[in-house]
């Protein structure tokens, strides 16, 4: 069904980092336009990137009121020019993305190590607390704020002289490990949510050594 | 040092809503702690009803979660319980927890190192 | 869920004598994540280890645990009669949270 020169939206992709999320879809438009609407499973719908000739629209501002929240959204197909026109049914054609939430789903973005401080045979190595663009009373929220312990990190260290490579973990965003004196340490950072079953693990974060910038080093 | 304090109602009505408070003491319910609700059924173990950061993000026992609210208002240094739907099988002593980490292997782990002294609450009309 | 069971259920011995509690995970728990708790009658439970084998701030050294995997021991070296109490695991790594049934560690 639908107006002889439309078309319907296809691969209906969300692609969500640390709650910034994007709907994209296909095809690039010929003689047509676009219009988005996302709702929650118990809401209305609302339009959003009206009449627009981009295949992509930001939802970020819509998921973020509540990140628990189970989500809807669907692209309309109208003809350039001729917004009004509808499909044989009466109504225009539109294609249904699959169901998102933002808690479950949202990748991990890549994390960074914030600071690593020696003091004599201990470092202790802090991750920035990414904020997100979750807010709650006027402010945002970082990562740890909205996944609390759900979220762990893994710490990679190794000597800079060898290639073996030794992990800890942590339910907040501070490792203390013991090293060797004398010795300069890499580090590298993964953040994990081990209840997830899909999208557990973020990229690993730059590669912070002993004896560059970001160290402290105290006796 | 941290004390903890729960208060509210100690008889709900069957099909009521169950409504605790705990008060902290001593410290700031911002600093990076988790706060809990367990509770102990007469002469039983105990139960973990669920948690909640500074910030709202909570996380709850499944066996429960429909039925259980908790939230924080930093400005007074509370936390709150609501169970709503109560039957007889509510009846228990209630406890507030402050979860702190802990550094152990390289990371920091949360435990439950200061309770509040609990506080009966019976259903029953 | 874990499924924590805690054997003896009730364990009778004099001051001074050894105590040995078991605790064991329905699957695997990381060490991390296992604490014991010691309650005594009307008060509320007290935190005595954590990462299975650490001691709290001011517990003393003859409470010790051990461990690993899904089996777990809580040790009191020389029972003080201010140790007869009730025991409890708890997993804090899987939600929900649980805890084992408890050990009644009681005077001969």
């Known amino acids: 069904s639908g107006t002889t020169n439309t078309v319907a939206a296809y691969n209906l992709t969300w692609k969500s980092t640390n709650f910034k999320t994007i709907l994209e879809w296909e095809p690039k438009p010929v003689n047509q336009v676009y219009t988005v609407q996302i709702s929650t499973k118990s809401g209305d719908w609302k339009s959003k990137c009206f009449y627009t000739t981009d295949t992509e629209c930001d939802l970020t501002d819509e998921i973020v009121k509540d990140v628990k929240q189970t989500y809807l959204a669907r692209v309309f197909s109208y003809p350039a020019g001729n917004v009004e026109s509808t499909g044989s049914a009466g109504e225009p054609l539109f294609t249904n993305a699959r169901k998102f939430l933002p808690y479950r789903d949202t990748k991990l973005g890549q994390p960074t190590i914030q600071s690593f401080e020696q003091v004599g045979t201990k470092v202790n190595v802090t991750v920035e607390d990414e904020r997100t663009l979750v807010r709650r009373n006027n402010t945002f929220l970082s990562l740890r704020d909205v996944f609390g312990k759900d979220l762990i990190y893994t710490l990679y260290y190794w000597k800079s002289s060898s290639s073996g490579k030794k992990t800890a973990k942590t339910n907040t965003n501070e490792f203390l490990i013991d090293v060797d004196k004398g010795e300069n340490y890499c580090f590298s950072v993964q953040a994990v949510i081990p209840s997830r079953t899909v999208n557990r693990k973020s990229t690993d974060s730059p590669v912070e050594c002993m004896g560059q910038e970001k160290g402290e080093f105290r006796e | 040092q941290v004390q903890l304090q729960e208060s509210g109602p100690g008889l709900v009505k069957p099909s009521q809503t169950l409504s605790l408070t705990c008060t902290v003491s001593g410290g700031s319910i911002s600093s990076g702690q988790y706060w809990s609700w367990i509770r102990q059924h007469p002469g039983k173990g105990l139960e973990w009803i669920g948690e909640i950061y500074y910030s709202g993000s909570t996380r709850y026992n499944p066996s429960l979660k429909s039925r259980v609210t908790i939230s924080v208002d930093t400005s007074k240094n509370q936390f709150s319980l609501k169970l709503s739907s109560v039957t007889a099988a509510d009846t228990a002593v209630y406890y507030c927890?402050?979860?702190?980490?802990?550094?152990?292997?390289?990371?920091?782990?949360?435990?439950?190192?200061?309770w509040g002294k609990g506080t009966t609450v019976t259903v029953s009309s | 869920e874990i499924v924590l069971t805690q054997s003896p259920g009730t364990l009778s011995l004099s001051p001074g004598e050894r105590a040995t509690l078991s605790c064991r995970a329905s699957?695997?728990?990381?060490?991390?994540?296992l604490a014991w708790y010691q309650q005594k009658p009307g008060q509320a439970p007290r935190l005595l280890i954590y990462g299975a084998s650490s001691r709290a701030t001011g517990i003393p050294d003859r409470f010790s645990g051990s461990g690993s995997g899904t089996d777990f021991t809580l040790t009191i070296s020389r029972l003080e009669p201010e140790d007869f109490a009730v025991y409890y695991c708890q997993q804090v790594g899987v939600v929900p949270y649980t805890f084992g049934g408890g050990t009644k560690v009681e005077i001969k």
């Open positions: 927890a402050r979860d702190t980490p802990y550094y152990y292997d390289g990371g920091y782990y949360y435990y439950m190192d200061v």
């Open positions: 699957q695997s728990v990381s060490s991390s994540y």
